[in-house]
């Protein structure tokens, strides 16, 4: 008689109850609810992966002052307005110098481009060539050439326009972008690659990430340097350096400034010009930032033919005169002398001013320092984030080396860069500390990075995203297979149905169990008698 009790309660609860209509209906509804819930959730999450993702491509030529770099980007066609899906698949540096150096021979620009463009053709499937947009953006080198000789600048751009007519891509134009655009696009790139704009929530909808801080961007080119960041509350909104940037329906109040002539190469020319101005001898000078046992001769034209140094020309200027700079590798003197290329006095100790009288709100949040900043830190054997002390001691150590030791310190030795890293490091110190007002406490918030994943941090990605409308101002968010309100409603309805059925079945189970229990108790009493 007792063996019956070894069965599971619901089983025991009976075979009779199972045949009752309400139970069957409840079980069916429960089953259907579970199937529907699982189905719509799976569809909502995985629907986008059902179709084989066709790829789209975009090409940007970053025509910098010292070189042109070609970037190829790709993204899944059906995720056009998603964030974080564009990745860099190829990068090619055009041989020779920047396009601004072709002012006297614009017809030679295309020949320089051809080798990289041939490689690019191999990176993009041929059937997509015609629909692949290609953009050329020229930066500070061409901004300077345009100021110096507008006709020459236009001829260079015309030569490029003409060349791209022969290429099998959808050429969208060659433009000289402003310093402000360069800064904003660099900031967009950094934050896009770091996933700071949007994130996917549980239902695979793109939402603004809660509490995520954007990253400031510090870019160092050959002819200009840019700073861009979302500033705090206290801001002079009347300055042209404050921009309202609307991305995915979220408005960012961005401070961005481009310092023309403060790119690495032009800043060094300013430095050499300053050394010449302050030297008693005009043809043989010492340079505390060049390594010991290193000397180099330049023509006066090399230093003074730039718009950035034209006002520092000596009275008896002859572009063909030769000047020799002898390196003394003196870290403290180098640091002291480099400060003089900045006009810090113009700020009159104002907190909201960087240098040369330029307005800047108080720096805020983390920063990514890329391009020339990264390469200089890398030469000092530094990357990522580190303390100001570490940066200073590495700079001191590097600047103390003599010329013959540098090839041992630098994995990629190139004379032009190697001789100037000491200058660059001291330049970065003054720019960041005395200019942008980074302190010992805030310096570790600067991350010196070259790329995120396999994508270079450069203004070019932000430029392409903007020009191909991949970052809409409004919040398009992704089109889901089931619209969010319908999805949530369906989810709520079937969850409620499932819970009700479970409650009903549980009630039936317990009721039947109670009934069986009383019957067993009665049987037991009879047996014992």
């Amino acid at each position: 008689m007792f063996t019956v009790l070894t069965r599971q309660p619901c089983e025991q609860a009976g075979l009779k109850a199972l045949y009752r209509t309400p139970t069957i209906i409840a079980l069916v509804v429960l089953l259907v609810s579970i199937v529907v819930l699982v189905s719509i959730t799976v569809i909502q999450i995985h629907k986008q992966e059902v179709l084989p993702p066709g790829l789209k491509y975009g090409i940007v030529l970053d025509a910098g002052s010292s070189r042109t770099t070609v970037y190829v980007y790709q993204w899944p066609a059906e995720k056009e307005n998603n964030t974080g899906v564009v990745s860099q698949t190829f990068k090619c540096s055009v041989k020779g110098s920047g396009i601004s150096s072709y002012g006297n021979n614009p017809q030679d620009v295309p020949r320089a481009f051809e080798e990289c463009m041939q490689k690019v053709k191999g990176q993009v499937p041929s059937h997509l060539h015609g629909s692949t947009p290609i953009h050329l953006g020229a930066t500070a080198g061409m901004r300077l050439l345009r100021l110096q000789n507008e006709t020459a600048a236009n001829e260079v751009l015309e030569s490029i326009q003409s060349y791209f007519k022969s290429q099998p891509f959808d050429f969208r134009g060659a433009q000289i972008i402003s310093g402000q655009e360069e800064g904003v696009y660099g900031w967009i790139t950094a934050n896009y690659l770091m996933g700071n704009f949007l994130e996917k929530n549980l239902w695979h909808m793109w939402v603004h990430p809660h509490g995520v801080e954007t990253t400031g961007a510090l870019d160092l080119g050959g002819a200009s340097t840019q700073i861009s960041f979302v500033a705090g509350e206290k801001m002079d909104l009347n300055t042209s350096d404050i921009m309202q940037v609307s991305l995915y329906g979220y408005v960012y109040t961005l401070y961005t400034h481009s310092f023309q002539c403060y790119g690495r190469n032009e800043a060094e020319k300013k430095f050499l010009a300053m050394l010449l101005q302050n030297s008693p001898t005009k043809n043989h000078l010492t340079n505390p930032c060049y390594p010991r046992d290193y000397s180099i001769s330049f023509t006066m034209g090399h230093v003074f033919d730039s718009l950035c140094t034209v006002d520092q020309r000596p009275e008896s200027y002859n572009p063909n005169d030769v000047i020799t700079f002898e390196g003394t590798g003196d870290p403290s003197l180098c640091k002291e002398k480099v400060a003089s290329i900045f006009d810090f006095k113009a700020c009159h100790d104002q907190e909201t001013c960087s240098f040369d009288g330029v307005y800047q709100p108080k720096i805020k949040g983390p920063f990514v320092a890329f391009a020339g900043f990264y390469y200089t830190a890398s030469a000092l054997n530094l990357s990522g984030s580190f303390s100001l002390d570490t940066f200073n001691s590495s700079t001191w150590n590097f600047c103390s080396q003599n010329w013959s030791q540098l090839p041992l310190l630098l994995p990629k030795f190139d004379e032009v860069y190697a001789r100037s890293y000491c200058f660059s490091a001291n330049y970065i110190y003054h720019l960041f500390v005395n200019g942008y007002k980074f302190t010992e406490e805030t310096w570790p918030q600067i991350h010196f990075e070259k790329e995120v994943g396999n994508s270079s941090i450069a203004w070019s990605l932000g430029y392409m995203l903007s020009l191909t409308n991949q970052i809409p101002a409004e919040s398009p968010l992704i089109r889901l297979p089931i619209e969010p309100p319908v999805f949530v409603g369906t989810l709520a309805f079937f969850t409620a149905a499932a819970l009700l059925c479970l409650a009903f079945l549980a009630y039936l189970c317990s009721a039947t169990r109670r009934k069986r229990h009383s019957e067993h108790a009665f049987d037991h009493a009879v047996d014992s008698d």
Epitope: R111, E114, S162, K165, S166, P168, F169, F171, G173
Partner: antibody
Amino acid sequence: EVQLVQSGAEVKKPGSSVKVSCKASGGTFSSYAISWVRQAPGQGLEWMGGIIPIFGTANYAQKFQGRVTITADESTSTAYMELSSLRSEDTAVYYCARGASGYDWSLDYWGQGTLVTVSS
Amino acid sequence: KIVMTQSPLSLPVTLGQPASISCRSSQSLVYSDGNTYLNWFQQRPGQSPRRLIYKVSNRHSGVPDRFSGSGSGTDFTLKISRVEAEDVGVYFCMQGSRWPPTFGPGTKVEIK
């Protein structure tokens, strides 16, 4: 005056290849784009591809990609178009044409045309 | 790729009378440099094509002034002010603004 002189008519078997030449005279050869255009009997014009001799690399229309090879010999100012895996529908007059301004496919000057007949 | 369409495909004309051929592109032909690379070619019977008009309205050297081109964006027209016997042939429009260059199907001009 720019002149483009093409090689003579060809009769080819299906599956074989044909190579047509185009010799330029008058003006600079290297810097101007040379295009190849074909015209099937009683049909319209179809751009096949082109080359800028100074670069030495050709660009092809998608339809002909992988089957056509365009080359240029700067020393003889001659451009060549080779079409492989011939089929009967490749029977056409093949023209070379040259632009007058730099790098575009403007087709200012035309050769006399080369009739290629594909027949078994 | 850009599709070029022409109308009419056949145009019977009377000597001395004007003639007009229309050409339409599936996309705007304004190139990034601001120019519109739309050309017109004439192909007389048994001859190679020759360029009549470039960049919409510019006559190629040696082309009689009775030929004129006009239009913008996606709609273009070739006009012959007074048709002469030597104008018989097929007229093609061709775009060079977008890759790859493409031709219209041609308009056959014949004397009535």
